[in-house]
Amino acid sequence: YDFTNCDFEKIKAAYLSTISKDLITYMSGTKSTEFNNTVSCSNRPHCLTEIQSLTFNPTAGCASLAKEMFAMKTKAALAIWCPGYSETQINATQAMKKRRKRKVTTNKCLEQVSQLQGLWRRFNRPLLKQQ
C-alpha cells in the first residue's frame, strides 16, 4: 500500500490521543535505553510503511504484535485516514487469520515495539533532518 495520500495530521492526532500510551504500557518495566533504534524512516509515507510492517508482519521471535491494543488502534486509524487502505487490507487479513498467533511478550517483541516508538516519534516530527 502507498501511504502517500494519507491524512498525516489526522493520523498524528490519533497516535497522540489513542495509541502512544498503549505503546508505553506495553514497554512498562523496560528501560528507555535498553534497545537501540535500528529502524529509521525518511518521510511520513515511509514511516507509515515501516510502522505497518513492524506492527502487522510476524518476525522471527515476535509473531504476536498484531493482536495488541496499539496494533488494533493503528489498523483502525490507517483505515480511516488512508484512502483505499481498508480495501487493500481485506485480502491480507484473510491470509493473516490462518496464521494468527497467541499473544506472547518476548524480549524480541519488546525490542520491536521500541523500534515502533522511534518510528512514530519520527513520523510526528517530519521536518527534522534525518540523523
Epitope: M69, A76, A79, S86, T93
Partner: antibody, heavy 117, light 107 residues
Framework: QVQLVESGGGLVQPGGSLRLSCAAS????????MSWVRQAPGKGLEWVSG???????YYAGSVKGRFTISRDNSKNTLYLQMNSLRAEDTAVYYC???????????WGQGTLVTVSS | DIELTQPPSVSVAPGQTARISCGGD??????VYWYQQKPGQAPVLVIY???KRPSGIPERFSGSNSGNTATLTISGTQAEDEADYYC??????????FGGGTKLTVL
C-alpha cells in the same frame, strides 16, 4: 450528516432469535470499526460486540456463541444476529461507530429488544 | 481483566465543581473516555484520550487519569449537566468496558 439508524427490535420469546440492522450514512462506513452496545432498562451501558472493516470480530463474554455481528459494506449496514435469547438480553441496543477501536463518537438512537414469554 | 468502578451518585450545587471518579486496576496505563447520557437519549462523548474534549463540548468539562483512578471534572456545573455519566476503557482481551455509571444531580 453522520447518522446511524437501528431497526429490527421487538418482543421475542426466550430461546428465540432476532436480527438487528443498522443503516449508516454520512461517512465512509467501510473504513470504520463498528460496535453494538446495549442498555438494560434502568441499568448501565454494556458493550456487546464489534467488527473491523475486514470482518474481524470481537464479543463480550456474555454473548459469545449466541450473537453474531456482521456487516455489508456495499449496503453501509451493520447487523447483529441474536440467537438463544434470554430475559437478561432485554435492553435498548445501540449501533455505534467506535473511533480507532477506541471511543464511541457516533451513536444510533437505539432499538428496544424485549425477551419475555 | 479490568473492572471500572464509579460512585452511583454525585450531588453538586449550581456553579460548583463536580468530580466523578472511575477506578480500575492500573487504569492510568490505559486511555479513559467519558459519556454523558440524559433520560431517553443516546450517550454523548464528552472526553476522549483521558483529557481531550470533542468539538462542541463546553470547556467546563475536563478529565484526568493516573494511577488507578480517572476523574471527570465539571467546573461551574449548570442545571443542564444533570445526567448519567459513564467512563469507558478497554481490557487486555481487546474488549470495551464501561463503568456502572454515576447519576449527577444538580441541587
Amino acid at each position: 450528516q453522520v447518522q446511524l439508524v437501528e431497526s429490527g427490535g421487538g418482543l421475542v420469546q426466550p430461546g428465540g432469535s432476532l436480527r438487528l440492522s443498522c443503516a449508516a450514512s454520512g461517512f465512509t462506513f467501510s473504513s470504520y470499526y463498528m460496535s453494538w452496545v446495549r442498555q438494560a432498562p434502568g441499568k448501565g451501558l454494556e458493550w456487546v460486540s464489534g467488527i473491523f472493516f475486514d470482518g474481524e470480530t470481537y464479543y463480550a463474554g456474555s454473548v459469545k456463541g449466541r450473537f453474531t455481528i456482521s456487516r455489508d459494506n456495499s449496503k453501509n449496514t451493520l447487523y447483529l444476529q441474536m440467537n438463544s435469547l434470554r430475559a437478561e438480553d432485554t435492553a435498548v441496543y445501540y449501533c455505534a461507530r467506535q473511533q480507532y477501536f477506541d471511543h464511541i463518537d457516533i451513536w444510533g438512537q437505539g432499538t428496544l429488544v424485549t425477551v419475555s414469554s | 481483566d479490568i473492572e471500572l468502578t464509579q460512585p452511583p451518585s454525585v450531588s453538586v450545587a449550581p456553579g460548583q465543581t463536580a468530580r466523578i471518579s472511575c477506578g480500575g486496576d492500573s487504569l492510568g496505563g490505559k486511555y479513559v473516555y467519558w459519556y454523558q447520557q440524559k433520560p431517553g437519549q443516546a450517550p454523548v462523548l464528552v472526553i476522549y484520550g483521558d483529557s481531550k474534549r470533542p468539538s462542541g463540548i463546553p470547556e467546563r468539562f475536563s478529565g484526568s487519569n493516573s494511577g488507578n483512578t480517572a476523574t471527570l471534572t465539571i467546573s461551574g456545573t449548570q442545571a443542564e449537566d444533570e445526567a448519567d455519566y459513564y467512563c469507558q476503557s478497554y481490557t487486555n482481551a481487546l474488549s470495551t468496558v464501561f463503568g456502572g455509571g454515576t447519576k449527577l444531580t444538580v441541587l
